[in-house]
């Protein structure tokens, strides 16, 4: 049994069948030695008296929030929340594994630049009675400071018959400086309370492997005198890592007819314009990656080519 | 990455070409090393990250933007103790800082290039024959030094007369590699920077 | 719906023995502390005994030695053995569950049953 927060205790326990559980010893937090007694929950039920209670934890009926009185004033709660473990593995119940970028992934995280600044998020199915706790740390054996918000729902989808909560969390490296080479990973817990089950979640990773630039702004068109070319403008986004002569992005230029299977045409650059056909109905399309090290691609910026 | 490959103005900043086909090389061999050694540890996530220039140069602090100058989190240990010569800098601009940060990328060629030549040499003893650096990678280091043109003492090569360890040896080539790669992004957006400006 | 549901009660005589039980059903998750409580004619209603989910028993004063409580945490019941029964335990005897159920599936509330008559003659 180990604390979460104060008067809330996690019980880790093996789960299968007759498994014998955790004995759990709870202590009255008050200076009083006699008349005191203990309820579980709503239930006035007395389940033992005395300073100390002993139960023994077994299955999501023994946990639950344990209350000492005495002479009808309340001393103190501890509220007993359960950790499973099946086969050597702890739960995942409460998190959607969302498959990417490989299995087992329940948290993914993304970057907009290299401020030390980046944003989780995770996926449930679960409506009520979650509550979510971030904390982050850069390494783990001498942890350097991330500060995080609370978690908070940030999108509803409907999938099939089922809804789909997506929460997210911003965190802010507090010490980062943008051209610092990173050997020690940030990492990302999160504990999650469901009801009386508590599951944790961990990420770890490099600020540089989760950049994600925003979209190229200002996409724009000019037409070319007497020709069916176009010079495509744009710019860094504003969220991109200043200088821009430092931090370069690469762009990747592509032109999509209006039907998915017309051919694609896609040009790379470095520069903030290119030169391309636009055919009629087309769109033309940037997005932009950072130049010198392969994470991910922004999303598309767009424009139509009439 | 299908990108089109920069072909440098003559006018341009000499070192620039010479960083960026660096980088390429370096993310080819270190490709090549993930893919050959697939059952070693060798992604990001298996290795321990080391750096052999830490303590010896300060590349990043040295070569810091003026505009993240102003970042008291970047200015932690700023080194000012480095040789002030070198073709790459076009006189007029030279300034100190610059000097210092050029020579500091060329310390750190150096120790991995020393390095390199050491691995090299033990995996080619290995009866295996699994892997060996790409001379591609240890051409265009070579290049960017001599683009450099510091003056500085040779290194020896480091010999070693134990048997390698060949497991212990591919393990370390791939955090050499992982490191040197970090490195490289890090020269080429200097580079880039310098030509900028 | 929850119910509890008593049986055992009748008239007995000063000295036997009774076997009350009682059956929860209805949607319940899971049940804590059973008890069983009683009421006499005039009187308050008192405590007998009580027995937690994992199976330690309590009794009141008047009723060690004498009475046993039981309970099949897998068929949701609980027993009380009364034995050497004395014409002061006549009383309506109330069965106690703190149960969880579907609506409240994290918290334990309190449900009584109907009550089954004990009347003991000298």
């Known amino acids: 049994i180990w604390e979460l927060k104060k008067d809330v205790y996690v019980v880790e326990l093996d789960w299968y069948p007759d498994a014998p559980g955790e004995m759990v010893v709870l202590t009255c937090d008050t200076p009083e030695e006699d008349g005191i007694t203990w309820t579980l929950d709503q239930s006035s039920e007395v389940l033992g008296s005395g300073k100390t209670l002993t139960i023994q934890v077994k299955e999501f009926g023994d946990a639950g929030q344990y209350t000492c009185h005495k002479g009808g004033e309340v001393l103190s709660h501890s509220l007993l929340l359960l950790h499973k473990k099946e086969d050597g593995i702890w739960s995942t119940d409460i998190l959607k594994d969302q498959k990417e970028p490989k299995n087992k992934t329940f948290l993914r995280c993304e970057a907009k630049n290299y401020s030390g600044r980046f944003t989780c998020w995770w996926l449930t199915t679960i409506s009520t009675d979650l509550t979510f706790s971030v904390k982050s740390s850069r390494g783990s054996s001498d942890p350097q400071g991330v500060t995080c918000g609370a978690a908070t729902l940030s999108a509803e989808r409907v999938r099939g018959d089922n809804k789909e909560y997506e929460y997210s969390v911003e965190c802010q490296e507090d010490s980062a400086c943008p051209a610092a080479e990173e050997s020690l990973p940030i990492e990302v817990m999160v504990d999650a309370v469901h009801k009386l089950k508590y599951e944790n979640y961990t990420s770890s990773f490099f600020i540089r492997d989760i950049i994600k630039p925003d979209p190229p702004k200002n996409l724009q068109l000019k037409p070319l005198k007497n020709s069916r070319q176009v010079e495509v403008s744009w710019e860094y986004p504003d969220t991109w890592s200043t200088p821009h002569s430092y931090f370069s992005l690469t762009f990747c230029v592509q032109v999509q007819g209006k039907s998915k299977r017309e051919k694609k045409d896609r040009v790379f650059t470095d520069k903030t314009s290119a030169t391309v056909i636009c055919r009629k109905n087309a769109s033309i399309s940037v997005r932009a990656q950072d130049r010198y090290y392969s994470s991910s691609w922004s999303e598309w910026a767009s424009v139509p080519c009439s | 990455r299908n990108l089109p490959v920069a072909t440098p103005d003559p006018g341009m900043f000499p070192c620039l070409h010479h960083s960026q086909n660096l980088l390429r090389a370096v993310s080819n061999m270190l490709q090549k090393a993930r893919q050959t050694l697939e059952f070693y540890p060798c992604t990001s996530e298996e290795i321990d990250h080391e750096d052999i220039t830490k303590d010896k140069t300060s590349t990043v602090e040295a070569c810091l933007p003026l505009e993240l100058t102003k970042n008291e989190s970047c200015l932690n240990s700023r080194e000012t103790s480095f040789i002030t010569n070198g073709s790459c800098l076009a006189s007029r601009k030279t300034s100190f800082m610059m000097a210092l940060c050029l020579s500091s990328i060329y310390e750190d060629l150096k120790m991995y290039q020393v390095e390199f030549k050491t691995m090299n040499a033990k995996l080619l003893m290995d009866p295996k024959r699994q892997i060996f650096l790409d001379q591609n990678m240890l051409a265009v280091i070579d290049e960017l030094m001599q683009a450099l043109n510091f003056n500085s003492e040779t290194v020896p090569q480091k010999s070693s007369l134990e048997e390698p360890d060949f497991y212990k040896t591919k393990i370390k080539l791939c955090i050499l590699l992982h490191a040197f790669r970090i490195r490289a992004v890090t020269i080429d957006r200097v580079m880039s920077y310098l030509n900028a400006s | 719906e929850v119910q509890l549901v008593e049986s055992g009660g009748e008239l007995v005589q000063a000295g036997g023995s009774l076997r009350l039980s009682c059956a929860a059903s209805?949607?319940?998750?899971?049940?804590?502390?059973m008890a069983w409580y009683r009421q006499a004619p005039g009187k308050q209603r008192e405590r007998v005994a009580t027995?937690?989910?994992?199976?330690?028993?309590d009794y009141a004063d008047s009723a060690k030695d004498r009475f046993t409580i039981s309970r099949d945490n897998a068929k949701n019941t609980v027993s009380l053995q009364m034995n050497n029964l004395k014409p002061e335990d006549t009383a309506v005897y109330y069965c106690?569950?703190?149960?969880?159920?579907?609506?409240?599936?994290?918290?334990?509330?309190?449900?009584w049953g109907q009550g089954t008559q004990v009347t003991v003659s000298s």
């Open positions: 209805g949607s319940i998750v899971s049940i804590s502390a």
């Open positions: 106690k569950a703190a149960l969880r159920t579907p609506t409240h599936d994290y918290n334990y509330y309190d449900y």
């Open positions: 027995i937690t989910r994992g199976g330690t028993p």
